[in-house]
Interface confidence: medium
């Protein structure tokens, strides 16, 4: 048994243009409240019971009224932690959903107005008894900063809160800093201390002196983002000695995608294609109405106001998937012609054209010989995106500027002797042979 604790640090407009000034309009005073929902990491719970580990609701925050023209202050937040008690073992890997709600006051006829401003979801690895983990999540134009931890309630101890540790009548039997544990009176437990330097944000330990990394981090102290690792193998657990990923099972082994999602390997990890109504890294988040904000990357949610009608996400350019969760690989359509290199810049598509071609899609074949001169009577031949000179006899090279030795290639067969001549070459054939190259 234990308690998951969530501390909201701030909620407000995220960085970048188009961010709202404040969740409260100047018309009506409002206040915020938060809801957290927890599920075991590999949960396949449907929406009927989406918070298998528990859920909690914050108190209402202080009332805030936006002052027109005044700089937007930090929004007042509800006091205290959101606490989700759990009865059984802490699962270690868990999914969370944090919702930010606005309650507008002032128009008391029929009660206040509520709005679900933001909904963030994620899957994390967390050992009970560890330090606070900090996180930043963005939902649309909003940014939520928070910390969380899981702690055991006495007498439970350990990273899963499954061991019992009861104070004994004679605690002095254990050395300094140690505490006696059940079931053996002479068994003493040391406080869990991770390897020195182990990142408090990205690492944790289940045994003293170790440093195990959260998803996305590697290195002996969990300080290296996986995406910047210089290792060759794209899969496997983190090696404590090199910080590199060592070969292991495939990321799709055992299908990590919940709720009927299908798994496909990517160069560094895996990708779940979720059925409608589910989303998240592993399709672990169930959401079936537009109120849940299931459309990512600025997708517009239509329909699905009631539970029996599916929502549809209308995705902005560059995104696809039932939840607009996948960036379209626009280069896979091979839009660049004539061998041009495709570059997807996110906001636009660019084609880098081969020499001799131009245009947005390299569709224009340039005159390769325009402005190109071949020396010494050579003629320009167009083709293949580059000019080529057909040189007069006795000359060679790209532009026919080099004097060529026609005898260099030993053109005279059967022992014939080659003589260079202003008009080309002459073969003096050995007895018994004839022809321009002594070939007969």
């Amino acid at each position: 048994a234990g308690v998951f604790e969530l501390q909201i640090h701030s909620f407000g407009p995220g960085p970048g243009p188009g961010a709202p000034r404040s969740p409260c309009s100047a018309r009506l005073p409002c206040r915020l409240f938060f809801r957290v929902c927890l599920k075991p990491g590999l949960s396949e719970e449907a929406a009927e019971s989406p918070c298998a580990l528990g859920a909690a609701l914050s108190a209402r925050g202080p009332v805030y009224t936006e002052q027109p023209g005044a700089p937007a202050p930090d929004l007042p937040l509800p006091d205290g932690l959101l606490q989700v008690p759990f009865r059984d073992a802490w699962p270690g890997t868990f999914s969370f959903i944090i919702e930010t709600w606005r309650e507008e006051l002032g128009d008391q006829i029929g009660g206040p107005a509520w709005s679900l401003l933001a909904r963030v979801a994620g899957r994390r690895r967390l050992a009970a008894g560890g330090p606070w983990a900090r996180d930043i999540q963005r939902a649309g134009a909003w940014e939520l900063r928070f910390s969380y931890r899981a702690r055991c309630e006495p007498p439970a101890v350990g990273t899963a809160c499954t061991r019992l540790c009861r104070p004994r009548s004679a605690p002095s039997r254990c050395g300094p800093g140690l505490r006696p544990c059940a079931p053996l009176e002479d068994e003493c437990e040391a406080p869990l201390v991770c390897r020195a330097g182990c990142s408090p944000e990205h690492g944790f330990c289940e045994q003293p002196g170790e440093c195990r990394c959260l998803e996305g981090w590697t290195g002996p102290l969990c300080t290296v983002p996986v995406s910047t690792s210089s290792c060759l193998s794209p899969r496997g657990p983190s090696s404590a000695t090199t910080g590199c990923l060592v070969p292991g099972p495939g990321p799709c082994d055992g299908n990590p995608c919940a709720n009927g999602g299908s798994c496909s390997e990517t160069p560094r990890s895996f990708e779940c294609t979720c059925p409608r109504g589910f989303y998240g890294l592993r399709c672990e988040v169930s959401g079936v109405t537009c109120a849940d904000g299931p459309c990512f990357n600025g997708g517009l949610c239509v329909g699905g106001a009631d539970p029996d009608s599916a929502y549809i996400c209308h995705c902005p350019p560059g995104f696809q998937g039932s939840n607009c969760e996948k960036r379209v690989d626009r280069c896979s359509l091979q839009p660049c012609r004539n061998g041009g290199l495709c570059l997807d810049l996110g906001h636009a598509l660019r084609c880098r054209c081969r020499a001799g071609f131009a245009g947005p899609r390299c569709e224009h074949d340039l005159d390769d010989c325009a402005g190109r001169a071949c020396a010494n009577g050579g003629t320009c031949v167009e083709g293949g995106g580059a000019h080529r000179c057909s040189c007069a006899l006795g000359f060679g090279g790209r532009d026919c500027r080099e004097r060529a030795d026609p005898c260099a290639a030993r053109p005279c067969a059967h022992g014939g002797r080659c003589y260079a001549h202003f008009s080309g070459l002459v073969c003096a054939c050995a007895p018994g042979y004839m022809g321009a190259r002594c070939e007969f």
Partner: nanobody
Amino acid sequence: EVQLAESGGGSVQAGGSLRLSCAASGYTYRSNFMGWFRQAPAKEREGVATIDSRGTITYYADSVKGRFTISQDNEKNTVYLQMNSLKPEDTAMYYCAAGGPRTNDDRWYPLRPPGYNYWGQGTQVTVSS
């Protein structure tokens, strides 16, 4: 077809208690919110209480705070309204409803009928003095 069926209404003396039930059927997923409304003769329908599908958000009309408790059982797809210390002015037809915000940032009124898409047929509660 989504269907909501209320039960548990009846006649009771002032100060008594009743427990209303609302069984939902016809859809796989829970609605975002389930609410109880009531309508007395010649009066407008008014919100009494609402609860979200995860059982964490509840809201009550001022007139019933401290006396009524809304709860839900997800396994049974049922929402309950426990009514204690009943008063004659609580006499009305009580309706169960399902609904919720349509989109993010949509203003949604938990105790107003337009915020709900589905309605039951109602169950009568009569409190005599």
